[in-house]
Amino acid sequence: ITGISPITEYLASLSTYNDQSITFALEDESYEIYVEDLKKDEKKDKVLLSYYESQHPSNESGDGVDGKMLMVTLSPTKDFWLHANNKEHSVELHKCEKPLPDQAFFVLHNMHSNCVSFECKTDPGVFIGVKDNHLALIKVDSSENLCTENILFKLSET
């Protein structure tokens, strides 16, 4: 069960393992998400990461985890959150009110040096990743693939 209020919040820019920036652009009244190289002095978009503590026994969660996990939601602008669209294997920005749907929650992984990964709460084994200069949902089918660069991201305050 995920806590109602976040244990902490953190405003950061999000970039890929290869230092490309995740940017958000308003187009035709909806937001598009891009993965791109920024020019030297170009300002990076910030994302509000809200961290929630999730506590459950493994038999309840079905994911084999028998204790705490950190869940995170990502909001680049007020009232909009990243959502996992598992049907389309896509990552989208949706406007919504709290309480947020499960599709807006991602299990945080940060066991790989100083990078993080985001696993769909609604679809264990599926992670936010980079595909063709866009964010997409990527199925990670073996433990070794958890370290593949396309699902690793860096958080930075600058």
């Epitope: 902490t8 985890v65 705490k68 996990m69 940060n110 066991m111 433990s143 958890l146 370290c147």
Partner: antibody
Framework: QVQLVQSGAEVKKPGASVKVSCKAS????????MHWVRQAPGQGLEWMGE????????SYAQKFQGRVTMTRDTSTSTVYMELSSLRSEDTAVYYC???????????????WGRGTLVTVSS | DIQMTQSPSSVSASVGDRVTITCRAS??????LAWYQQKPGKAPKLLIY???RLQSGVPSRFSGSGSGTDFTLTISSLQPEDFATYYC?????????FGGGTKVEIK
């Protein structure tokens, strides 16, 4: 219940290597990183590194880079820490320790082994 | 590496006293700070995580606060079993680093 059982005390000569084991039980082994922290007599805590049992990737403190190797055996839920080129300053209690949150070290370390005393003396 | 500076290095106090220990990070670590208690010959014990969250089973006389670079551990009314050494640890980035420790001794 969660348990981390470490191998017994070791006495080594300078220049030798030591390999300490840590057998985990009572939880899903591959869902949690395993850290190694050491404490020299009368001194503070020093983080050495972490192994991710899921894929075997490691992160080591710069100080130990090139001298430490962390490995794991998922079939026995055991992690190993090998430290080479031992010197007297490596005399310490070596702890294996598990974070309190799966997949993440952000929420601190809540499970510790009892420690393995490694004495380096000629 | 992020340096963690703890103060004081030792404090003498009596049962019932309020004890405050501070920890400063050399750069911002958000709220990713943990506090541990260690008694001689024993492994450390997690008291507080995420700067202010009380670990399950830890008495409520222990509390933590702070974010960014400055953090505090407070023991509101010191008990006989609280005489120990306390360490802060940043959990934000590798390498994880510990403060030098604060020994709480009987006055």
């Amino acid at each position: 219940q969660v348990q981390l059982v470490q191998s017994g005390a070791e006495v080594k000569k300078p220049g030798a290597s030591v390999k300490v084991s840590c057998k985990a039980s009572g939880y899903t082994f591959i869902s949690y990183g395993m850290h190694w922290v050491r404490q020299a007599p009368g001194q503070g805590l020093e983080w050495m590194g972490e192994i991710n049992p899921h894929g075997g990737s490691t992160s080591y403190a710069q100080k130990f880079q090139g001298r430490v190797t962390m490995t794991r055996d998922t079939s026995t839920s055991t992690v190993y820490m090998e430290l080479s080129s031992l010197r007297s300053e490596d005399t310490a209690v070596y702890y294996c320790a598990r974070p309190s949150a799966a997949y993440s070290h952000y929420l601190g370390i809540d499970m510790w082994g009892r420690g393995t005393l490694v004495t380096v003396s000629s | 590496d992020i340096q963690m500076t703890q103060s004081p290095s030792s404090v003498s106090a009596s049962v019932g006293d309020r004890v405050t220990i501070t920890c400063r990070a050399s750069q911002g670590i958000s709220s990713w700070l943990a506090w541990y208690q260690q008694k001689p010959g024993k492994a450390p014990k997690l008291l507080i995580y995420a700067a202010s969250r009380l670990q399950s089973g830890v008495p409520s006389r222990f509390s933590g606060s702070g974010s960014g670079t400055d953090f505090t551990l407070t023991i509101s009314s010191l008990q006989p079993e609280d005489f120990a050494t306390y360490y802060c640890q940043q959990a934000n980035v590798f390498p994880l680093t510990f403060g030098g420790g604060t020994k709480v001794e009987i006055k």
